[in-house]
């Protein structure tokens, strides 16, 4: 159910060399909870490095340093997992390298358990003083998201205390989780109040409830398991742009879409244009005109500039990217005023990247 | 999890037509491009050409421009490719893929007079 | 169109052995190149992509290399079950051409 005619072909074409797009899937880098991490920004020539967490700016505090090309994040908490990017910004141009990072205990496949503290986690309480269950250490349970790669080891603990000691279960996605239900099972560690799931699939994502009862009470906690798939994606556009913008007839307005892509992408530049007068095609779809698309002959294709507009050119503009695995697109509107109104670009929204499928 | 399920085999004659359906699960449809590979008996891959759940794009091979069609059904999830003016060169396994990454099983494709 | 030469076609191997398959382009793809396994009556199975990554699943003995016009897969310990028919393909532009293959048969 194609949602537009096309004036042009907007079939997947030879893509341009990949000098603007980070082709590969971003670095993971890996920091347990307390650790020191410092990360270098790869990217050449850089006149001014600017970083982004989440898509929002990240600057200096007392745990982050940005330091040159440096950025060091100094007794790393599970807040600082997320994607990273850095821009140098040059006369010419821009650039922008993204990362994650991932603040986890998470073990890593292979390795056996690694708790070194689980005696001080199985509390005995004096048989006399009859007490409902109780968490003996939140710290290990701040993190509620887990995002691992496919096939790593995951471990939940629910450290907890309580007389008589409580007894520990665990449900998926609110019903009883059974070994049955993964292939390989699962290890339950009930001295280190822990479920450990090695050789994590996809099919393991779901929430994680740790139930922790005794005759005096019952609490839990709930994790969100997300297994990260290696395997490529469709291209990933930076939130707000292109931006909405103004100007006088006769001037000139540049829209940019920033691309993150892990396979080569194809851009095209699109408007609603007229055809015979009309605005829409016999089959009621809008007509659209390829302004511009990534090719040999074509320079930054992230940067659509258009030169002395005219009122016709007011209207949206649309970015749409595409590589084997899929497509996304964001637009703009250009509005174009008359001689004698100044002038003025619209307010860019900044907002965090979407995270697609 | 993610799964491909390709229509059953087809015995065609030559000038024929064949629909062979894909049906996809386990994820967001309109999200990736559905790609046809088809392989002649004892030969290698060749790729046919692909569609865009969300919006209908497609792209193909100059060499089947003319005689394949590729349609997507989002209320079923489903993407079908049609071969026309078929000839004994078209017998192959004709096979689906989610952006190369997850693959249906393979239909096979039999022309014969 | 894009030509994709694979070398060898065919080779012989033992259970331990370390192997290498080479692909190459006609023209600089740049790192657009996943390679692909295929065993008799079944789909391909996607190994490596972008390349140099390794898909979901996929054993760590394999590994690929390369870009521009030049690319390699590599299989460190050779294992009874990657007997197999293996397909290089260009994904940096339409039509997305495959390798000849190279079919790794036992020693």
């Known amino acids: 159910r194609p949602s537009f005619s096309l004036v042009e072909d907007t079939t997947l074409e030879p893509e341009e060399p990949p000098t603007k797009y980070q082709i590969s899937q971003p670095e993971v880098y890996v920091a347990a909870p307390g650790e020191s991490l410092e990360v270098r920004c790869l990217l050449k020539d850089a006149a001014v490095i600017s970083w982004t967490k989440d898509g929002v700016h990240l600057g200096p505090n007392n745990r982050t340093v940005l330091i040159g090309e440096y950025l060091q994040i100094k007794g790393a908490t599970p807040r600082d997992s997320g994607l990273y990017a850095c821009t140098a910004s040059r006369t010419v141009d821009s650039e922008t390298w993204y990362f994650m990072v991932n603040v986890t205990d998470a073990i890593s496949s292979g390795d056996d358990e690694d708790d070194t503290d689980g005696a001080e986690d199985f509390v005995s309480e004096n048989s006399n003083n009859k007490r409902a269950p109780y968490w003996t250490n939140t710290e290990k349970m701040e993190k509620r998201l887990h995002a691992v790669p496919a096939a790593n080891t995951v471990k939940f603990r629910c450290p907890a205390g309580g007389n008589p000691m409580p007894t520990m279960r665990w449900l998926k996605n609110g019903k009883e989780f059974k070994q049955e239900h993964r292939i390989g099972g699962y290890k339950v560690r009930n001295q280190h109040w822990s479920l450990i799931m090695e050789s994590v699939v996809p099919s393991d994502k779901g929430n994680y409830t740790c139930v922790v009862e005794n005759e005096y009470g019952s609490i839990n906690h709930t994790y969100h398991l997300d297994v990260v798939e290696r395997s490529p994606h469709r291209p990933i556009l930076q939130a707000g742009l292109p931006a909405n913008a103004s100007t006088v007839v006769g001037g000139d307005v540049e829209f940019v879409c920033k691309v993150y892509s892990d396979a080569q992408p194809h851009i095209q530049w699109i408007k609603h244009v007229e055809k015979n007068g009309s605005k829409y095609g016999p089959d009621g779809l809008p007509y659209l005109k390829v302004l511009k698309h990534s090719g040999i002959n074509s320079s930054n294709a992230e940067v659509l500039a258009l030169f002395n507009v005219t009122e016709a050119d007011a209207g949206e503009y649309i970015c749409k990217v595409s590589n084997y695995i899929g497509q996304a697109n964001q637009s703009a509107w250009l509005t174009v005023l008359p001689k004698q109104q100044a002038p003025g670009r619209e307010k860019e929204i900044t907002a965090s990247p979407d995270y697609l499928e | 999890q993610v799964q491909l399920v390709q229509s059953g085999a087809e015995v065609k004659k030559p000038g024929a037509s064949v629909k062979v359906s894909c049906k996809a699960s386990?994820?967001?449809?309109?999200?990736?491009?559905i790609h046809w590979v088809r392989q002649a008996p004892g030969q290698g891959l060749e790729w046919m050409g692909a569609?865009?759940?969300?919006?209908?794009?497609?792209s193909y091979n100059q060499r089947f421009k003319v005689r394949a069609t590729l349609t997507a059904d989002t209320s079923t999830s489903t993407v079908y490719m049609e071969l026309s003016s078929l000839r004994s060169e078209d017998t192959a396994v004709y096979y689906c893929?989610?952006?190369?990454?997850?693959w249906g099983q393979g239909t096979t494709v039999t022309v014969s007079s | 169109d894009i030509q994709m030469t694979q070398s060898p076609s065919s080779l012989s191997a033992s259970v331990g052995d370390r192997v290498t398959i080479t692909c190459r382009a006609s023209?600089?793809?740049?790192?657009?190149l996943n390679w692909y396994q295929q065993k008799p009556g079944k789909a391909p199975k996607l190994l490596i992509y972008?390349?140099?990554n390794l898909a979901d699943g996929v054993p760590s003995r394999f590994s690929g290399s390369g870009s521009g016009t030049d690319f390699t897969l590599t299989i460190s310990s050779l294992q009874p079950e990657d007997f197999a028919t293996y397909y290089c393909?260009?994904?940096?532009?339409?039509?997305?051409?495959f390798g000849g293959g190279t079919k790794v048969e036992i020693k």
């Open positions: 893929a989610r952006a190369f990454t997850y």
């Open positions: 386990g994820y967001i449809f309109t999200n990736y491009y």
């Open positions: 569609i865009y759940p969300d919006n209908g794009d497609t």
């Open positions: 023209e600089n793809i740049y790192g657009a």
């Open positions: 972008g390349a140099t």
């Open positions: 393909q260009n994904v940096l532009s339409t039509p997305y051409t």
